[in-house]
């Protein structure tokens, strides 16, 4: 049976100072050069060792970078974006998406929002009546002390 | 990949007029330039045109004779030159901004970062 992958997708501010070896990663993508099918946008397809990203550590591999200083990454060729990063200065403000996968299991067998296919709250009702018995439990040898 | 692809050049009698057109591709929204090399001299700049074409700048040897333009949606630039002269005679290099949309044009070499192969002009 085949699997559906979801993601979860979230949007970071991360402000980089550049360092001997650039911003620390390389870059794929373009209007002449797409990466992702009908998407023409700019992904990060390497972090350097112990460069500038990897140092800071929030930008990742695969991650998505939606403007640069503020200049938007929407249509643009590739080497033109490459020289964006190249001119953006010493200190340097991305705008990133990160793409989270959050599921990957058969379909028909899932619940909305849980990695593990059971509904979360076939899960949490069990957890918590076992706890409050738990409780009552101990109250009552307590009090028989 | 970036390529500029010179164009238009060739043999012209004195007060003659040639235009230069410069194909450009991998690159756009640059500052654009013409520089021009005659032999046995160092390369100078000619004119420069920025990336929306609403400011250009000229070398005081060619001002009046040269216009600088260009087809934004041809990602092309163009030399329209006039009234040519001996001393014109060089080999013409078109050249783009190393800086995607950089505000300021100027006739710097290290300002331009992609060149094209250039264009025999011959003046007799």
């Known amino acids: 049976m085949n699997g559906r992958v979801d993601y979860l997708v979230t949007e970071e501010e991360i402000n980089l100072t550049r360092g001997p070896s650039g911003l620390g990663f390389n870059i794929v993508g373009g209007t002449d050069q797409q990466y992702v099918s009908n998407d023409s946008g700019i992904y990060v397809s390497r972090i350097k060792e112990n460069g500038a990203a990897a140092l800071d550590g929030r930008l990742q591999e695969g991650d998505k970078i939606l403007s640069v200083n503020g200049q938007d990454l929407k249509n643009l060729l590739h080497q033109d974006a490459v020289d964006l990063f190249r001119n953006a200065g010493y200190a340097v403000s991305l705008r990133v998406q990160h793409r989270l996968q959050v599921q990957n299991g058969p379909i028909g067998h899932r619940g909305e929002g849980d990695p593990s296919g059971i509904p979360i709250f076939m899960v949490l009702v069990p957890v918590f009546a076992l706890t409050m018995v738990a409780a009552w439990a101990f109250m009552r040898y307590r009090q028989q002390l | 990949q970036v390529q500029l692809v010179e164009s238009g050049g060739g043999l012209v009698q004195a007060g003659g007029s040639l235009r230069l057109s410069c194909a450009v591709s991998g690159v756009s929204f640059r500052n654009m330039g013409w520089f021009r090399q005659a032999p046995g001299k160092e390369r100078e700049f000619v004119a420069a045109?920025?990336?929306?074409?609403?400011?250009?700048v000229y070398v005081d040897s060619v001002k009046g004779r040269v216009t600088i333009s260009r087809d934004n949606a041809k990602n092309t630039v163009y030399l329209e030159m006039n009234s040519l002269k001996p001393e014109d005679t060089a080999v013409y290099y078109c050249?783009?901004?190393?800086?995607?949309?950089?505000?300021?044009?100027?006739?710097?070499?290290?300002?331009?970062?992609?060149w094209g192969q250039g264009t025999q002009v011959t003046v007799s």
């Open positions: 050249a783009a901004d190393g800086r995607f949309r950089a505000g300021q044009i100027g006739p710097s070499l290290g300002l331009y970062h992609y």
């Open positions: 045109i920025s990336w929306s074409g609403d400011s250009t």
